[in-house]
C-alpha cells in the first residue's frame, strides 16, 4: 500500500479502503467467515466492505487479514475503523451465540507473508465495541449508521505490519479501514519554513525543529517550532524577516515593485520612492535620484533627493573706515534642504574685470568666510582705493556632489575713505494713522553732493522678517501705507558718487491711532 496525504494535513495515510479501486483481496479464514461485499455509495462509487453475521453458531473464530502495510516513516500508527454492528436484540432467537464486539490484532514484519497466516502470532490491540456515537453514510438507497473507532499501535520497528480483525460471533460490516500516522506538516510560520516532522512515540515529549527562512528572508532570531504528538506545531520561537527590497505578503517575501523600495530588513511594507527619486527594477533597497538631484551621505533612503541651492539674492554692503559689512537674502531655491551655508570668495579686480586675482590672506572675515549660516559677514583689514569683488555662494549638503559650478552672486565694492558720514538725529514731524513725516540732519561730511538717502523700515514686532525701503533726495520723507498705532523702526544711509555711507542707528516712531492728533516728537534712538 502506498501512502498518500489525505485531506487532513497532519495525517499520512498508509491505507484507505475507500480509495481502493479494485478488490481489496484481504485474506479470510475460514472461508465461510468474513465475506467481501462491494457496496455502492450515493455517487455510484464502490465501497469495499467485509461482512460477517455468523450469529447462529457458537464459538465463532473468523479472521480477516489486511495486505502488508509499509509503515513508511511512522513509529506510532493509528487505525480508524468505520463499521456497523447489529444489535443482538434484533435477532432474539440467537441471543446465546450473538456477540456485539470484534477484536483488532497486528503483527510486525519486514516483508509480506504472502498467503501464510498464523493468527496465534498476532498481538491483540483491543476489543472493539460500538459506542453511542454514529455517523451517517449513504449506501445507495440505504442510510447507514456508522460507528467510528480509532486505535493506536506502536512503536512499530519493522518495515511494515499486518492488521487482523477477529469476529467471535457478531453481525458486523466493516465499511472502511484507514491506517495513518501523524506528522507535523510542512508549515511556514513567521517567514520560516518547517519541514514535515514525525512526532516522538512518547506523547509527552516534543521534537524541536529549526526552521529555515523563506526565499528573500533572513533570520532575526533562530526560528524554532516544537512538534507535538498529535501532529500539531507548538511554541513558536524566533522569526525571519524580509530582506531589503522585499516585503511580507501572506507569509512570503515579495520583491518591491518598480517605484517602491525597502531600505532595511524587517517586516515593514515597501515604500513609494521619495520625491525626485525613482527605480525601474524590482527588489530595490534605495531609490536613485533624478538627474540634478542628490542624496547626501548621511541622508536616510526615505528622504527626498535634493539639489544644490540657487544663488543668494539682494547682496548689499555697508562700509566705513574700518569695516565692510556684506548682507544678502537667502536663495529663492534652497534645493529642498535646511542645511544651507554660505561662503564668501574675495577677488581683487582691475578696471578689466576679467583680470582678477585672489584677495590673499590680508582680509579678515568675521565670523569666517566659509560655512556661514547667517546672511551677513564683516570684512576687516581691507586696503583703500581697491575694487574688491565678493562672490557669495550658497551651498547645502549635496553641493559637493554636483559637477555644476556653484551658483553665486557677486558685488563689487570700492574702498574709498571718502564715503559720506552718517546722518544726525532723526525726528517725527507728524504722524497719522497710515503715514509718518520724518526729517533728519544731513551728514556733517559728505565729500561731494548727496545723491539721495535710502530709508529702510520695518515693524518693530516683526523685526527683520520683512522690510521696506524708500528713497528721498532731501533729508526728509513722508512714509505712507503704514498700519495705525504701530511702532516702526527706521534707519537711513547716504549715497554720494563715492558710494553709500553705513546705516544710521535705528530710530523708533509710532503711527497714530484713530483719535490722535498729528504730533511732532524727537526720535527715540535704539541701541
Amino acid at each position: 500500500w502506498t501512502g498518500d496525504c489525505s485531506h487532513v494535513s497532519n495525517q499520512v495515510v498508509l491505507l484507505d479502503t475507500t480509495t481502493v479501486m479494485g478488490e481489496l483481496g484481504w485474506k479470510t479464514y475460514p472461508l465461510n467467515g468474513w465475506d467481501a461485499i462491494t457496496e455502492m455509495d450515493e455517487h455510484n462509487r464502490p465501497i469495499h466492505t467485509y461482512q460477517v453475521c455468523n450469529v447462529m453458531e457458537p464459538n465463532q473464530n473468523n479472521w480477516l487479514r489486511t495486505n502488508w502495510i509499509s509503515r513508511d516513516a511512522a513509529q506510532k500508527i493509528y487505525v480508524e475503523m468505520k463499521f456497523t454492528l447489529r444489535d443482538c436484540n434484533s435477532i432474539p432467537w440467537v441471543l446465546g451465540t450473538c456477540k456485539e464486539t470484534f477484536n483488532l490484532y497486528y503483527i510486525e514484519s519486514d516483508e509480506s507473508h504472502g498467503t501464510k497466516f498464523k493468527p496465534s502470532q498476532y498481538i491483540k490491540i483491543d476489543t472493539i465495541a460500538a459506542d453511542e456515537s454514529f455517523t451517517q453514510m449513504d449506501l445507495g438507497d440505504r442510510i447507514l449508521k456508522l460507528n467510528t473507532e480509532i486505535r493506536e499501535v506502536g512503536p512499530i520497528e519493522r518495515k511494515g505490519f499486518y492488521l487482523a480483525f477477529q469476529d467471535i460471533g457478531a453481525c458486523i460490516a466493516l465499511v472502511s479501514v484507514r491506517v495513518f500516522y501523524k506528522k507535523c506538516p510542512f508549515t511556514v510560520r513567521n517567514l520560516a519554513m518547517f519541514p514535515d516532522t514525525i512526532p516522538r512515540v512518547d506523547s509527552s515529549s516534543l521534537v524541536e525543529v529549526r526552521g529555515s527562512c523563506v526565499k528573500s528572508a533572513e533570520e532575526r532570531d533562530t526560528p524554532k517550532l516544537y512538534c507535538g504528538a498529535d501532529g500539531d506545531w507548538l511554541v513558536p520561537l524566533g522569526r525571519c524577516i524580509c530582506s531589503t527590497g522585499y516585503e511580507e505578503i501572506e507569509g512570503s517575501c515579495h520583491a518591491c515593485r518598480p517605484g517602491f523600495y525597502k531600505a532595511f530588513a524587517g517586516n515593514t511594507k515597501c515604500s513609494k520612492c521619495p520625491p525626485h527619486s525613482s527605480t525601474y527594477v524590482e527588489a530595490t533597497s534605495v531609490c536613485h535620484c533624478e538627474k540634478g538631484y542628490f542624496r547626501a551621505e548621511k541622508d536616510p533612503p526615505s528622504m527626498a533627493c535634493t539639489r544644490p541651492p540657487s544663488a543668494p539674492r539682494n547682496v548689499a554692503f555697508n562700509i566705513n573706515e574700518t569695516a565692510l559689512i556684506l548682507e544678502w537674502s537667502p536663495p529663492s531655491d534652497t534645493g529642498g534642504r535646511k542645511d544651507l551655508t554660505y561662503s564668501v570668495i574675495c577677488k581683487k579686480c582691475g578696471l578689466d574685470t576679467t583680470q582678477c586675482e585672489d584677495c590673499g590672506g590680508g582680509l579678515r572675515f568675521i565670523p569666517r568666510h566659509t560655512g556661514l549660516i547667517n546672511n551677513s559677514v564683516v570684512v576687516l583689514d581691507f586696503v583703500s582705493h581697491v575694487n574688491y569683488t565678493f562672490e557669495i555662494e550658497a551651498m547645502n549638503g549635496v553641493s559637493e556632489l554636483s559637477i555644476s559650478p556653484k551658483p553665486f552672486t557677486a558685488i563689487t565694492v570700492t574702498t574709498d575713505h571718502d564715503a559720506p558720514s552718517l546722518i544726525g538725529m532723526m525726528r517725527k514731524d507728524w504722524a497719522s494713522q497710515n503715514s509718518l513725516a520724518l526729517s533728519w540732519q544731513a551728514p556733517a561730511f559728505s565729500n561731494g553732493a548727496i545723491l539721495d538717502y535710502e530709508i529702510k523700515y520695518y515693524e518693530k514686532e516683526h523685526e527683520q522678517l520683512t522690510y521696506s525701503s524708500t528713497r528721498s533726495k532731501a533729508p526728509s520723507v513722508i512714509v505712507t501705507g503704514l498700519k495705525p498705532a504701530t511702532t516702526y523702526i527706521f534707519h537711513i544711509r547716504v549715497r554720494t558718487a563715492t558710494g553709500y555711507s553705513g546705516y544710521s542707528q535705528k530710530f523708533e516712531f509710532e503711527t497714530g491711532d484713530e483719535t490722535s492728533d498729528m504730533a511732532a516728537e524727537q526720535g527715540q534712538i535704539l541701541v
Epitope: 465461510n32 453475521c53 447462529m56 435477532i91 440505504r142 447507514l144
Partner: antibody
Framework: QVQLLQSGAEVKKPGASVKVPCKAS????????MSWVRQAPGQGLEWMGW????????TYAQGFTGRFVFSLDTSVSTAYLQISSLKAEDTAVYYC??????????????WGQGTLVTVSS | EIVLTQSPATLSVSPGERATLSCRAS??????LAWYQQKPGQAPRLLIY???TRATGIPDRFSASGSGTDFTLTISRVEPEDFAVYYC????????FGQGTKVEIK
Amino acid sequence: QVQLLQSGAEVKKPGASVKVPCKASGYTFTSYAMSWVRQAPGQGLEWMGWINTNTGNPTYAQGFTGRFVFSLDTSVSTAYLQISSLKAEDTAVYYCARVRLTVYGDGMDVWGQGTLVTVSS
Amino acid sequence: EIVLTQSPATLSVSPGERATLSCRASQSVSSNLAWYQQKPGQAPRLLIYGASTRATGIPDRFSASGSGTDFTLTISRVEPEDFAVYYCQQYGSSWTFGQGTKVEIK
C-alpha cells in the same frame, strides 16, 4: 451450489399426519436458520415460523402451534415440517426457506421448490 | 401482530414503464422489511432486505426505500419477466407478509 430440496406432493386424509423433508446442500447447514412458509391455493404467503438449526430451538407464528412441529436431522442437513391431525384447510404448498441474517437485515434468500399437501377425504 | 397492507392489489403497466408498489405497516418496523417476487408455479425470490438493500443477483432496476411504517418498491423500467406478484414481509416483531400486489401487463 446452494439449494433446498423438498419432497413431492402428498395427498392425505383428514386426521392423518404428514412429514415434509427439506434437504440442504451447498452450505453449512447449521449456520443458517430454516423458515417454513405456507401458501394456500390462490392465496398469499403465510409465515409459519423457523427453527434454529444450531440449537434445534423452534419459533412458531400465531396460528401454527400445537399441530405443527419443526425438527432437524443435522447429520443429513435436513429440516422437517410435521403436521398432525390434518384438516382440509391445511391444503397448501409448504415451502422451506433459508434465513440469511446480515448486518443490514434478514431475508429468506434460498427457497425449496415447495411441497403440495392435499387433505381430502 | 403487525399487519402489512399492500397497495394497489393489482398494478397494470406496460413494459418500459415505471412501477411503484406500496407497503404500509400497522406499526413501526424500522428498516426490518423485505420484498419478494413470485411467479406462477414458482417459489418466491428474495429481492430486497433491510428495506433497501438489493439481494445478490437482483438487477438495479429494482430499488426500495422507506423506514418505520411506509415502504416503496420501484421498478424503474418494467421488463417482460417482471410481471409477477410482489410481497412485502416484516421481521421487526415476529414475521408477517403483506397480501401481495399483482403486476400485470397493461
